[in-house]
């Protein structure tokens, strides 16, 4: 399956926080989305192959890495002034 | 590769039919439809892969356009349990 952690996160002003996303489905592609209350998903970053990732529609204030097929951590940087949201990770073949 | 869904909001009577659409200017190798209930993560309903494909899931019918740039979700005889946020992803 696909596992995201932590389930809840509080961030101090000016801090960077990292959300973990791990999958054991052998999927090549991984995605991070942000969902604000009552809204649909907006793509932050996606990766289709190890060592490569591309910006989605709202990449500002976020960073990612893809060093392993199984893992695609998302860092919410201090530059993200409005980080409060529901974050979703997804994977696909 | 932005996907646009329409309509954004839909309120119907029980027993009515409804169709929601998902469009893009880009080609997708596959499209997924999800349903999300308040406070929960999205639940995958279906993945469509082949252009022109039609998939049925009880009262739900999913279509993938021939050019693989659009998809639709049709619900026949909607019920209160169908209430939720429907999301299209590619």
């Amino acid at each position: 399956g696909i596992t995201q952690s932590p389930k809840y996160l509080f961030r101090k002003e000016g801090q960077n926080v990292t959300l973990s996303c791990e999958q054991n489905l052998n999927h090549d592609a991984m995605y991070w989305y942000r969902q604000d209350p009552g809204q649909g998903l907006r793509l932050i970053y996606y990766s289709q192959i190890v060592n490569d990732f591309q910006k989605g529609d709202i990449a500002e204030g976020y960073s990612v890495s893809r060093e392993k097929k199984e893992s695609f951590p998302l860092t919410v940087t201090s530059a993200q002034k409005n980080p409060t949201a529901f974050y979703l990770c997804a994977s696909s073949i | 590769q932005l996907l646009e869904q329409s309509p954004q909001f839909l309120s119907i009577q029980e027993g009515e039919n409804l169709t929601v659409y998902c469009n893009s200017s880009s080609v997708f190798s596959s499209l997924q439809w999800y349903r999300q209930e308040p406070g929960e993560g999205p639940v995958l309903l279906v993945t469509v892969v082949t252009g022109g494909e039609v998939k049925k899931l009880k009262r739900l019918t999913f279509q993938f356009g021939d050019a693989r740039k659009d998809s639709s979700l049709h619900i026949t005889a909607a019920q209160t349990g169908d209430t939720g946020l429907y999301l299209c992803a590619g």
Epitope: N26, D28, A29, Q48, I49, V50, N51, D52, Q54, K55, K69, I93 | Q1, S26, V27, F28, S29, G90
Partner: antibody
């Protein structure tokens, strides 16, 4: 029918730069990645990098960072590769090749190649 | 980078014989292996893509197998038109990497 038409052979002096082109037809240019591959005489193939014409995203093989620059012109469906500070090691045939954007598959259609000779 | 060890470097076979080329990777790449044929003066031609998928128009005498780190490309009954260089390519990981190639000649 998918076609990738590459520019003609180049004879250039050491230290100079060269910019080659690859004109795509028969498909929607922005729907697919464009890769560039080097083949030195009698040798194997080396992947240089790729560009996504839709958003200009590039990814380079570390070995070619600073040597190659990939660009596109969407309106003419043309991809370009510029090589700088040329040496005899850069003498080779360079191919452009396309691959689908999603999923990330191998290159399925290739140009005929551009021969670059670096000589004083 | 994922290193690809392709063998043999060259091969001389008679018409009708079975040809096998191997490619071994230093790390597991699942089924993300591709095989190309290149004839003199031409660009490479994709024969098999990921998942041992035979590409359209490629003769059925060609086959490909393997998963993980050990892969094989086979020509069941060699024909004179199969004389070419053959390359494996991994597409699991960037940078994409090719094998050193196998030159197939007619005996």
């Amino acid at each position: 029918e998918v076609q990738l038409q590459e520019s003609g052979p180049e004879l250039v002096k050491p230290g100079a730069s060269v910019k080659m082109s690859c004109k795509a037809s028969g498909y929607t240019f922005t729907d697919d990645n464009m890769h560039w591959v080097k083949q030195s005489h009698g040798k194997s193939l080396e992947w240089i990098g790729y560009i996504n014409p839709n958003n200009n995203h590039t990814n380079y093989n570390q070995k070619f960072k600073g040597k190659a620059t990939l660009t596109v012109n969407k309106s003419s469906s043309t991809a370009y590769m510029e090589l700088r500070s040329l040496t005899s090691e850069d003498s080779a045939v360079y191919f452009c090749a396309r691959s689908t954007v999603v999923p990330f598959y191998a290159m399925d259609y290739w140009g005929q190649g551009t021969s670059v000779t670096v000589s004083s | 980078d994922i290193k690809m060890t392709q063998s043999p470097a060259s091969l001389s076979m008679a018409i009708g014989e079975k040809v096998t080329i191997r490619c071994i990777t230093i790390t597991d790449i699942d089924d993300d292996m591709n095989w190309y044929q290149q004839k003199p003066g031409e660009p490479p031609k994709l024969l098999f893509s990921e998942g041992n998928t035979l590409r359209p128009g490629v003769p059925s005498r060609f086959s490909s197998s393997g998963y993980g780190s050990d892969f094989a490309f086979t020509i069941e009954n060699m024909l004179s038109e199969d004389v070419a260089d053959y390359y494996c390519l991994q597409s699991d990981n960037l940078p994409l990497t090719f094998g050193a190639g196998t030159k197939l000649e007619l005996k």
